[in-house]
């Protein structure tokens, strides 16, 4: 049984140009994280496997950072950048478990972060 | 298009150590991706033997840890297996690899290494 | 470690036939599976990735399947060039295993 929530940045906004570190938190479980997926859309940025470490998307590579912790920094953010990002934790032996966060790149300066959400 | 090419001895006596060399062309080991090396034993058997990521930082087959060294050079765009203390278990034809995502999308053409004495 | 098991080790068939090639992995992969061809003194080309993807180049004669532990590779309407040996590979956690191999041979 499935008993664990994965709790994200939310909702999200940025400035274009600037950075912003997307992350999620996996609680109320005692599975093991074998593996955390980033993706935006369908397409994979990056995958943090526990055994192997990190892998970016090569064509992401030049604006997507590893990190803090199994989140995952984008850099020169651009509008097109807009969009829903999920993290898929693959865990064991509970099995898979998503978050979603979604950002939006401002062209002003008035970018404001969102309220942190839970997905059960 | 990318290539790569291993090069070394094809003969090494046993308790030396085997070094090999992959040649990159046509994309830079810095780049992304990470750079594997692979064995392929008489016998039909594949096995996977560690990588060196882009940043450089290294990953090794558990089984091979004790023995194993991957390094690069940059500046070359070259990758280098080493391979301690070696016997007749270590004759096979070794690969060297690109690596998406832990799967190998671009392989070299292959080097046989024999140990004997 | 996470086992690969390939079956069957070797397989007869005639050109224009349709053949099936399976892999289990002794636990939960995902689809975390790649399948590559070798023929006879040449090096593995990647088929498949991520169980179904096939890889650039590849003709859609082929076709992954497959999720969890259970997965497979189908030719269809086999073509002089498709005999050779068949590996699959998890890409999933340390170490990186291959299956022992499934040999294709021409009937």
């Known amino acids: 049984m499935m008993t664990g929530t994965i709790e994200t940045t939310g909702n999200i906004s940025a400035e274009k140009g600037g950075s912003i570190i997307l992350q999620c938190h996996l609680s109320s479980t005692t599975a093991q994280v074998t593996q955390v997926n980033w993706e935006q859309q369908d397409q994979l940025l990056a995958i943090c496997n526990a055994d192997l470490g990190w892998h970016i998307s090569p064509s992401f590579k030049d604006r997507v950072a590893p990190g803090p912790g199994l989140g995952l920094t984008l850099q020169s953010l651009t509008v097109n950048d807009t969009g829903e990002y999920f993290c898929i934790y693959h865990t064991y032996p509970d099995g898979t478990y998503t978050g979603r966060i979604f950002l939006e790149v401002l062209e002003s300066s008035v970018a404001e972060h969102g309220a942190r959400f839970q997905i059960p | 298009d990318v290539q790569l090419q291993e090069s070394g001895p094809g003969m090494v006596k046993p308790s030396q150590s085997l070094s090999l060399t992959c040649t990159v062309t046509?994309?830079?080991?810095?780049?992304?991706?990470?750079w594997h090396w692979i064995r392929h034993f008489p016998g039909n058997k594949l096995e996977w033997m560690g990588f060196?990521?882009?940043?450089?930082?290294?990953k090794y087959n558990p089984s091979l840890k004790s023995r194993i060294s991957i390094t690069h050079d940059t500046s070359k765009n070259h990758f280098f297996l080493k391979l301690n203390s070696v016997t007749s278990e270590d004759t096979a034809t070794y690969y060297c690899?690109?690596?998406?995502?832990?799967?190998?999308?671009?392989w070299g053409t292959g080097t046989t290494v024999t140990v004997s004495s | 470690d996470i086992q690969m098991t390939q079956s069957p080790a070797s397989l007869s068939a005639s050109v224009g036939e349709t053949v099936t090639i399976t892999c289990r992995a002794s636990?939960?992969?995902?689809?975390?599976l790649a399948w590559y061809q070798q023929k006879q003194g040449k090096s593995p080309q990647l088929l498949v990735n991520?169980?179904?993807t096939l890889a650039e180049g590849v003709s859609s004669r082929f076709s992954g399947s497959g999720s969890g532990t259970q997965f497979s590779l189908k030719i269809n309407s086999l073509q002089p060039e498709d005999f050779g040996s068949y590996y699959c590979?998890?890409?999933?956690?340390?170490?990186?295993?291959f299956g022992a191999g499934t040999k294709l041979e021409l009937k």
């Open positions: 590979q998890h890409h999933y956690g340390n170490p990186l295993m």
């Open positions: 046509g994309y830079s080991i810095t780049s992304g991706y990470d």
């Open positions: 636990e939960n992969i995902y689809s975390y």
């Open positions: 991520n169980a179904k």
């Open positions: 690899a690109r690596g998406s995502y832990w799967y190998f999308d671009v």
């Open positions: 060196i990521s882009d940043s450089g930082s290294t």
